[in-house]
C-alpha cells in the first residue's frame, strides 16, 4: 500500500501545532477496534508529524490506520481534511517500476514492508545514500528518479525523496531497497529490527 | 497452526511444463510470501523465487529466469510454481516455504510444504 | 552469487559428544545466515536464523555463532535424533543461496 501512509503523513503535516497536539489527546481516548491497543501516553505527546504517522501505521496498520486518523480528525471538526485523507487512501496506485514483474492488476497490500515500517527512521539515518541509488538504478528507479533523488542536498531530504516514490512499488522493489540496506548499513537493519 | 499442503508427485517428458501448487493455512495468506527451494536427488538446495500474494509480485533466481513462474491465487490461498522447457536435470523435489516472518528484514523458512516429487524422464 | 561452503563434508560422532559445524560465505553477509537440519524423506526444519536466534521450540544444544565471512552451528551433546544433514542459508541478498550440507553421521 504505503499509500495510505503517505496519505495520514499528508494530513498530519497539514496541522498546525496546536491542532497536532489536541489530534494527540483525542487518540488517547477514540474508541478502537477490539484486538488493538493504545499509543503509550508519554511517546505518543513528544512525537512530531511523520514519527506519529510511523506509529500509527506500526500499531494499527495503514487501512485502520488511515480509517482512525479521519475519525479523529472528524471529531476535532476538521471533515474536509479526513474527507481528503480517505479519498486519497482510496485512489488507484500508480504503475510499477521498472525491471520487476508487475502483478496482473494491483491489489492493496494487507501488510507492512520492512522499510515501511521503519520509514521515518531510514530517513533520519540512512548515510549510504548514492550507494543505494546505484544499487536500484535501472530495477527500480528511472533516470528521472534517480537523477531527483541525487539533486536534494541532504541525506534525509535524499531518502525522504527516494520514500516519495514508494506509494508506486510493489513488495519486491522495497525488497530490493532492503537487500541494499543490508549490504550498505547493515548494522542499521540490524538496530531497526531490534527495535 | 500454519501449514503448506502441496501437490503429487509429477513425471514430465523433457521439453515440456509442471505445474506444481501450494495450498496454504493457518494464517493470512495475502501478508506473507511464499518461496520455492528445490532439492535434486542427493543434492542441496537451491532456491528458485517467491511471490507476496499481497500485491502478485515475484522475484525469481536469474538462474530460472524466463524458465520459471510463480503466480498466486487468493481465492483459494494458492501459489503455484510453473517450470517449463524441462530437462534431466530438473528431477527434484520441489518444496513451497513461508518465512517465520515476511515483515523482518530477512526470509528464513520456518514453514514447509512437503514437497512434490518431479522426474523428468523421456 | 554468494556461496556458502560448509565444512566437514562429512562429521563422525557419537551421542553425547559436541558438534561444531562450520559455514563460509564468499562475501560478507553480517548476521544474514541461518541453519537448517534436514533427515530423509523430510523438508528441512529451521533451527537458527540471524546467525544465533534459537527459533521456536529447537533444543537449547543447539547454537549458532558468527559473523561476516564464517559462522558455526554448535550441537553441545548430540542425541540420537540429531544425525542428519545440516545446512547453512544466506539471507543477505538474492539469489538466496544454501550451503552444500554438512552430513552429521554416528561413529
Known amino acids: 500500500m504505503g499509500r495510505a501512509r503517505d496519505a495520514i503523513l499528508d494530513a498530519l503535516e497539514n496541522l498546525t501545532a496546536e491542532e497536532l497536539k489536541k489530534f494527540k489527546l483525542k487518540l488517547l481516548s477514540v474508541p478502537l477496534r477490539e484486538g488493538y491497543g493504545r499509543i503509550p501516553r508519554g511517546a505518543l505527546l513528544s512525537m512530531d508529524a511523520l514519527d506519529l504517522t510511523d506509529k500509527l501505521v506500526s500499531f494499527y496498520l495503514e487501512t485502520y490506520g488511515a480509517e482512525l486518523t479521519a475519525n479523529v480528525l472528524r471529531d476535532m471538526g476538521l471533515q474536509e481534511m479526513a474527507g481528503q485523507l480517505q479519498a486519497a487512501t482510496h485512489q488507484g496506485s500508480g504503475a510499477a517500476p521498472a525491471g520487476i514483474q508487475a502483478p496482473p492488476q494491483s491489489a492493496a497490500k494487507p501488510g507492512l514492508h520492512f522499510i515501511d515500517q521503519h520509514r521515518a527512521a531510514l530517513i533520519a539515518r540512512v548515510t549510504n545514500v548514492e550507494w543505494l541509488l546505484d544499487a536500484l538504478y535501472g530495477k527500480v528507479l528511472t533516470d528521472e528518479q534517480y537523477q531527483a533523488v541525487r539533486a536534494e542536498p541532504t541525506n534525509p531530504s535524499k531518502m525522504r525523496k527516494l520514500f516519495s516514490f514508494t506509494p508506486a512499488w510493489n513488495w519486491t522493489c522495497k525488497d530490493l531497497l532492503l537487500q541494499a540496506l543490508r549490504e550498505s548499513q547493515s548494522y542499521l537493519v540490524e538496530d531497526l529490527e531490534r527495535s | 497452526q500454519v501449514q503448506l499442503v502441496q501437490s503429487g508427485a509429477e513425471v514430465k517428458k523433457p521439453g515440456s511444463s509442471v505445474k506444481v501448487s501450494c495450498k496454504a493455512s493457518?494464517?493470512?495468506?495475502?501478508?506473507?510470501?511464499i518461496h520455492w527451494v528445490r532439492q535434486a536427488p542427493g543434492q542441496g538446495l537451491e532456491w528458485m523465487g517467491y511471490?507476496?500474494?499481497?500485491?502478485?509480485?515475484?522475484m525469481y533466481n536469474e538462474k530460472f529466469q524466463g524458465r520459471v513462474t510463480i503466480t498466486a491465487d487468493k481465492s483459494t490461498s494458492t501459489a503455484y510454481m510453473e517450470l517449463s522447457s524441462l530437462r534431466s536435470e530438473d528431477t527434484a523435489v520441489y518444496y513451497c516455504?513461508?518465512?517465520?516472518?515476511?515483515?523482518?528484514?530477512?526470509?528464513?523458512?520456518?514453514?514447509w510444504g512437503q514437497g512434490t516429487l518431479v522426474t523428468v524422464s523421456s | 552469487e554468494i556461496v556458502l561452503t560448509q565444512s566437514p563434508a562429512t562429521l563422525s560422532l557419537s551421542p553425547g559428544e559436541r558438534a561444531t559445524l562450520s559455514c563460509h560465505a564468499s562475501?560478507?553477509?553480517?548476521?544474514?545466515l541461518s541453519w537448517y537440519q534436514q533427515k530423509p524423506g523430510q523438508a528441512p526444519r529451521l533451527l537458527i536464523y540471524?546467525?544465533?536466534n534459537l527459533h521456536t521450540g529447537i533444543p537449547a544444544r543447539f547454537s549458532g555463532s558468527g559473523s561476516g565471512t564464517d559462522f558455526t552451528l554448535t550441537i553441545s551433546s548430540l542425541e540420537p535424533e540429531d544425525f542428519a544433514v545440516y545446512y547453512c542459508?544466506?539471507?543477505?541478498?538474492?539469489?538466496?543461496?544454501f550451503g552444500q550440507g554438512t552430513k552429521l553421521e554416528i561413529k
Open positions: 516455504a513461508r518465512p517465520l516472518y515476511s515483515y523482518a528484514s530477512y526470509y528464513w523458512f520456518a514453514y
Open positions: 493457518g494464517y493470512t495468506f495475502t501478508d506473507q510470501t
Open positions: 511471490i507476496y500474494p499481497g500485491d502478485g509480485s515475484a
Open positions: 562475501q560478507n553477509i553480517n548476521v544474514w
Open positions: 540471524k546467525s544465533s
Open positions: 542459508q544466506q539471507g543477505q541478498s538474492y539469489p538466496l543461496t
